[in-house]
Amino acid sequence: EDELQVIQPEKSVSVAAGESATLCCAMTSLIPVGPIMWFRGAGAGRELIYNQKEGHFPRVTTVSELTKRNNLDFSISISNITPADAGTYYCVKFRKGSPDDVEFKSGAGTELSVRAKPSAPVVSGPAVRATPEHTVSFTCESHGFSPRDITLKWFKNGNELSDFQTNVDPAGDSVSYSIHSTARVVLTRGDVHSQVICEMAHITLQGDPLRGTANLSEAIRVPPTLEVTQQPMRAENQANVTCQVSNFYPRGLQLTWLENGNVSRTETASTLIENKDGTYNWMSWLLVNTCAHRDDVVLTCQVEHDGQQAVSKSYALEIS
Amino acid sequence: EDELQVIQPEKSVSVAAGESATLCCAMTSLIPVGPIMWFRGAGAGRELIYNQKEGHFPRVTTVSELTKRNNLDFSISISNITPADAGTYYCVKFRKGSPDDVEFKSGAGTELSVRAKPSAPVVSGPAVRATPEHTVSFTCESHGFSPRDITLKWFKNGNELSDFQTNVDPAGDSVSYSIHSTARVVLTRGDVHSQVICEMAHITLQGDPLRGTANLSEAIRVPPTLEVTQQPMRAENQANVTCQVSNFYPRGLQLTWLENGNVSRTETASTLIENKDGTYNWMSWLLVNTCAHRDDVVLTCQVEHDGQQAVSKSYALEIS
């Protein structure tokens, strides 16, 4: 009779975390009589996964009834797989012996790899705002994935970025891995509505990448432009001067009118007009009673935006 | 010697569409000599999947070298699985015969089920806008999933909806399935920023449901409220009357001022103020030269919003 063979038909099995893994094993003969055991790993440090003869293995179920006399199928199913279960599993036939059973023959082994999904990527931006034409850094982090192979891309709106650096840790074998990437983004005036997107592709995601986003609105400060103009006279002896504060972000803005250097009125912008690009406009107007002035008046519109140093624009009002 | 057994250790195997399926099969003896074949299904209509002896099976690879003299492992791998591959696969041993080989023994069969992901859900809303307190319908559709079991929920913002009806087609067995659901949503004035979400859970999604969204902003019309008020006089002989047009959506709005029923000025709203709830406000003002009027004046602010019938509010200006 042909000598018993231990057949482990699958060289490798890949299972998603949380699922069950079935490891196939069949004997080609009932003899020599003796139990089978499953181990993870080989050599002295191998870990017992299942012993047909004795012990309690709550996560392991046998596919066939191993107590049946003519059973040759010793496949097992391991429930609730985690990345820590990855490794090579050996189905080992023992022959009966005294005082101990003797290892007789091992299967070729089945490598179990565990597919664990990356956590949702978390994107974080700079601690302080920067103005257009400056460069800011965004980081993207995700953890707990396996296998190690992962692809990370950065986008600003729909456009792929190239200035970034990515690390996957640890460098060696591990039950699961983490990724950390830093992208450098040059701000433009139109970036209030812009987003940076960190996109990760992994075998567990079946072609649907995970995305983490951050709004550049949290990272940008667009300083206002000021324009002071005189409006057509609505009534005699009255001049209507407006200060158009344009294209600023974020909202926080305080405006002070000065007449010949003296504070005339201070206002905090409230009902702002939002532009399509997400910046804001605001207009303030000053009615000047020309009867009260003999000489020309210098009107100054002074704006303090988002806690920054004030900017101003002046207008010389001719008293005719 | 014990008679040859055909061992198919796995009763069932579940594979994601696009992956490969490994079907395990082992013989317990080299005799009787003869080839093996794999079939899908049993009986007269069974479909040949692999023939060790002859034929071309581009999607099938053998796990072991079947030409090796003492090979007892006849496991196969089928690549690029689609829902159409679902079924029960039998590993069948033939013994050599003349003129034809004779079927000798079949394995117990392995049922292959294919997990196919639902397509991204597409949510569509009503063709015409409706006003608050009215009910509108949204539909959600997804296709191509397997197995048939699927769970669909509707949410308005974070709150689960109960008024919906869902169908999964076809009712009988199929390689893949489609889902169609219709939800009825009662609009409220604050719904410009609201979303309806169609959420689908399926075994292939590993606990991350697919979501389709629609914005109620596409389905709602919030008519404006009008308020006409007189502002403090900036100059003698001038009355400043404002028309505050509040909480309307969408943007499209035309305003006409009438003095004693005669058109004074028509404006199209452009620079609007956006409220937190997504509705818009706009203010128009009219400077009335009281010198030109002997008697009281009735000023009317008439607004046409989003192509609907005009609404108006009047104000009696007393000429003192």
Partner: antibody
């Protein structure tokens, strides 16, 4: 067919030795261990020991240690049990039995038994 | 050594009766218990192995149950050929031990 054929009855004097044979046929002899079980007249079953030709392993009951030897001859598919220094309480029917459990011990095939009488 | 205690030591029953024999191990033996039938002048015959598995060729009126320390052999409907002595045997470890036997007699 699958069977175990034992040697004939023996009458022995106290202090003598007896060697009982058990010939296997119809199956692969080296594949299965053989146990020896005895039964004194009107008594229950008593396990004596075990031998596995595959590795030459043996295991004997403590009370018989030093008096019993079990051997096999794979060329003739025969198992032997020799019991020395016989006493009157060794009078019994001696059975050989094939042991078939993979993780456990049970006996699915028995010889017909050999009566050994120890009498002065 | 693992002691096996069988009860009752004898039972009188009639054809068609349901007969139950119990066996207790002095320590846990998982499911590694066998049941044998022996008739006078004959070798024992294996009925049940691994506590509940019916040996090939044995009628289905015989069944076994139990695990750990307590086991039962049941004959669902006693037939004339079933009058015999029944032994349990632990197969968990050396030395292999048998119960004292239960004699099933005609009432």
């Amino acid at each position: 067919q699958v069977q175990l054929v034992q040697s004939g009855a023996e009458v022995k004097k106290p202090g003598a030795s007896v060697k009982v044979s058990c010939k296997a046929s119809g199956y692969t002899f080296t594949g299965y261990p053989i146990s020896w079980v005895r039964q004194a007249p009107g008594q229950g079953l008593e396990w004596m020991g075990w031998i596995y030709a595959y590795g030459g392993n043996t295991n004997y009951a403590q009370k018989l240690q030093g008096r019993v030897t079990m051997t096999t001859d794979t060329s003739t598919s025969t198992a032997y049990m020799e019991l020395r220094s016989l006493r009157s309480d060794d009078t019994a029917v001696y059975y050989c039995a094939r042991e078939a459990g993979s993780s456990w011990y049970d006996f699915d095939l028995w010889g017909r038994g050999t009566l050994v009488t120890v009498s002065s | 050594d693992i002691q096996m205690t069988q009860s009752p030591s004898s039972v009188s029953a009639s054809v068609g009766d349901r007969v139950t024999i119990t066996c207790r191990a002095s320590q846990g033996i998982s499911s590694w218990l066998a049941w044998y039938q022996q008739k006078p002048g004959k070798a024992p015959k294996l009925l049940i192995y691994a506590a509940s598995n019916l040996q090939s060729g044995v009628p289905s009126r015989f069944s076994g149950s139990g695990s750990g320390t307590d086991f039962t052999l049941t004959i669902s409907s006693l037939q004339p050929e079933d009058f015999a002595t029944y032994y349990c045997q632990q197969g968990a470890s050396f030395p292999i031990t048998f119960g004292g036997g239960t004699k099933v007699e005609i009432k």
